[in-house]
């Protein structure tokens, strides 16, 4: 998985004689918004083949009202880049369409009118993860420089994105024949040679065609926990060294779609089922017709002459999704729950919980207090709909399991001294403070101003 | 015992709209996505849709999309089937069918058939 | 969609025959397949998940084999209660497609 992203720098007049002074007609201003479909291959494809690899639309750009007599501007664009997600690997020969619109906004009958301005067909090759591409492409009469590359998402890396990283077994090194893997120094590079299906999690290999389980996990593709209750609580982001790798927090915390998307976890990125009449990566792109072209993967627009009425996308087979975006795959049905991810192994579905969920479909909630141990005397303490463990003096961590110096908290105020003690802490307070945690100030007449019953 | 049960046989008008129920039993409703097959007199098997019980989302064959609506009661443990505008080509027999939400297994179990008969 | 071609459409055979149907999908699609038996007026019963998986309570004379995009279904002693329409289906991809049935028919 990974983000193809493609940045517009200037749109206008080519150098030659009679080249056109404004994208705008003479009935007044006009903006400009841009098209990108990216198709798999280096074949001539028909110019209606549909953007297989995916396609994005830019938000519209500001006005621009042609001056008589003046120079001819820079053009005005839209703002930021153009972001094509890809689910698969990237295949590193593709076509290249960038189609410039303009939307005159005069006094058009039934509100804005949209035409295609330029069109321009590239094949190219391109490595995922190197460096932005810049190209100059001329349309007619028009002029489009613009930059271009494919970045993996991570735990993808490599030329195709289809290596995996992972944690490093040890601090100091990766595996025999492993290099780091940029830019993550940290990690290591997964051997891309384990069983078909082996967990990328749980499992790991030193051997072709091996799949061997880390602690607490097992079956021949590493992905049958021995036992929950040894995970419970060891669910931060990093809980490796115990085997369970329960991943933290997940990319659809906080939920990135705008305009009333929904957030579903993709292998790591995240995927907006947008709302009719909004697309882009986060639902972003509004007041889309059909004249813009929002149905991909040859879908049939109907309706929407006008941003304010809606248009509706006829899917062809096997594809679905307000923009007809999103392929229909046997993980479409959303089987895991609770935000978990849908692994399709070939000869079954499978479920990558997120943290504080377990179960085949991610169904059980560790994280409550029926299930959740509280060790060294802690109590486990519910509200919010969160649940944590309340520890003991001289405990602490997410179970109360680690010692924790009562101290540690600079717990005495106004300076008072604090001393570990076998029944928990003693502050010994300042001249002038009194009180359990030296909190009350002493009054020269010996009165402390301690708070009203 | 897993069972499905299905409602009764349905005579009906051109035009008119037919609502087919499959009542689960015996498992856990929402573990299980449920399928839909048509047989028309003397034919074939033919996949209609499918729906996963626990969230709603429903996935349909392109020849069943638009007059056909799929849709659960959770409650009751119990999937329907609703076809609108009906045709005479709608006659035939209406199964559910349950498989496994992780498609470890196939179509398992099966609800005895309902016979929708179209005719004026 | 994917195309389920199953030979033979009919067959005929007596009982303790050994009978075999096949199953082609139009690509490969990796043992997400089953078997089905459906008699006269009755609903259809699974036989054979994942192209080789008995299905609870099914007798050990029905047996599933193959790869790719070729499966077969051996009954290895047809027995009378045996004889039916049978149909081999596809869940590799949506949408699921059967394929056109057998008639198993008395010798």
């Known amino acids: 998985a990974g983000v193809f992203e493609l940045q517009i720098h200037s749109f206008g007049p080519g150098p030659g004689p009679g080249a056109p002074r404004s994208p705008c007609s003479a009935r007044g201003p006009c903006r400009l918004f841009f098209r990108v479909c990216l198709k798999p291959g280096l074949s001539e494809e028909a110019a209606e083949s549909p953007c297989a690899l995916g396609a994005a639309l830019s938000a519209r750009g500001p006005v621009y009202t042609e001056q008589p007599e003046a120079p001819a501007p820079d053009l005005p664009l839209p703002n930021g880049l153009l972001q094509v997600p890809f689910r698969d690997a990237w295949p590193g020969t593709f076509s290249l369409i960038i189609e410039t619109w303009r939307e005159e906004l005069g006094d058009q009958i039934g509100g804005p009118a949209w035409s295609l301005l330029a069109r321009v067909t590239r094949r190219r090759r391109l490595a995922a993860g190197g460096p932005w591409a810049r190209d100059i492409q001329r349309a007619g009469a028009w002029e489009l420089r613009f930059s271009y590359r494919a970045r993996c998402e991570l735990p993808a890396v490599g030329t195709a994105c289809t290596r995996l990283c992972r944690p490093r077994s040890a601090p100091s090194r990766c595996g025999p024949g492993l290099r780091p893997c940029a830019p993550l120094e940290d990690e290591c590079e997964a051997p891309p040679v384990c069983r078909a299906g082996c967990s990328l999690e749980h499992g790991f290999c030193e051997q072709p065609g091996e799949c061997r389980c880390l602690e607490g996990w097992t079956g021949p593709l590493c992905m049958v926990p021995v036992s929950t209750s040894s995970c419970l609580g060891l669910r931060g982001p990093s809980s490796t060294t115990t085997g369970c790798l329960v991943p933290g927090p997940g990319p659809c915390d906080g939920n990135p779609c705008a305009n009333g998307g929904s957030c579903s976890e993709t292998p790591g990125s995240f995927e907006c089922t947008c709302p009719r009449g909004f697309y882009g990566l986060r639902c972003e792109v509004s007041g889309v017709t059909c004249a813009d072209g929002p149905c991909f993967n040859g879908g049939l627009c109907v309706g929407g002459a006008d941003p304010d009425s809606a248009y509706i996308c006829h899917c062809p087979p096997g594809f679905q999704g307000s923009n007809c975006e999103k392929r229909v795959d046997r993980c479409s049905l959303q089987p895991c729950r609770n935000g978990g991810l849908c692994l399709d192994l070939g000869h079954a579905l499978r479920c990558r919980c997120r943290a504080g969920f377990a179960g085949p479909r991610c169904e059980h909630d560790l994280d409550d207090c029926a299930g959740r141990a509280c060790a060294n005397g802690g109590t486990c303490v519910e509200g919010g709909g969160a649940h944590r463990c309340s520890c003991a003096l001289g405990f602490g961590g997410r179970n109360c399991r680690e010692r924790a110096d009562p101290c540690a908290a600079r717990p005495c105020a106004h300076g008072g001294r604090c001393y570990a003690h076998f029944s928990g802490l003693v502050c010994a307070c300042a001249p002038g403070y009194m009180g359990a945690r030296c909190e009350f100030p002493v009054h020269p007449d010996g009165v402390s101003a301690l708070p009203a019953a | 015992e897993v069972q499905l049960v299905q409602s009764g046989s349905e005579l009906k008008k051109p035009g008119a709209s037919v609502k087919v129920s499959c009542k689960a039993s015996?498992?856990?409703?929402?573990?299980?996505?449920m399928n839909w097959v048509r047989q028309a007199p003397g034919q074939g098997l033919e996949w209609m849709g499918i729906?996963?019980?626990?969230?709603?989302?429903?996935i349909y064959n392109h020849k069943f999309k638009g007059r056909f609506a799929l849709s659960v009661d959770k409650s009751s443990n119990t999937a329907y089937l609703q076809i609108s505008s009906l045709k005479a080509e709608d006659t035939a027999v209406y199964y559910c069918?349950?498989?496994?939400?992780?498609?470890?297994?196939?179509?398992?179990?099966w609800g005895q058939g309902t016979t929708v008969t179209v005719s004026s | 969609d994917i195309q389920m071609t199953q030979s033979p459409s009919s067959l005929s055979a007596s009982v303790g025959d050994r009978v075999t149907i096949t199953c082609h999908a139009s690509?490969?699609?990796?043992?997400?397949m089953g078997w089905l038996q459906q008699k006269p007026g009755k609903a259809p019963k699974g036989l054979i998940y994942?192209?080789?998986n008995l299905e609870d309570g099914v007798p050990s004379r029905f047996s599933g084999s193959g790869s790719g995009a070729d499966y077969t279904l051996t009954i290895s002693s047809l027995q009378p209660e045996d004889f039916a329409d049978y149909y081999c289906?596809?869940?590799?991809?949506?949408?699921?497609?059967f394929g056109g049935g057998t008639k198993v028919e008395i010798k």
């Open positions: 690509q490969g699609i990796s043992g997400n």
């Open positions: 289906v596809q869940y590799a991809q949506f949408p699921y497609t």
């Open positions: 015996g498992y856990t409703f929402t573990d299980y996505y």
């Open positions: 069918a349950r498989q496994d939400s992780l498609l470890d297994y196939a179509m398992d179990y």
């Open positions: 994942h192209g080789a």
């Open positions: 729906i996963n019980p626990y969230s709603g989302v429903t």
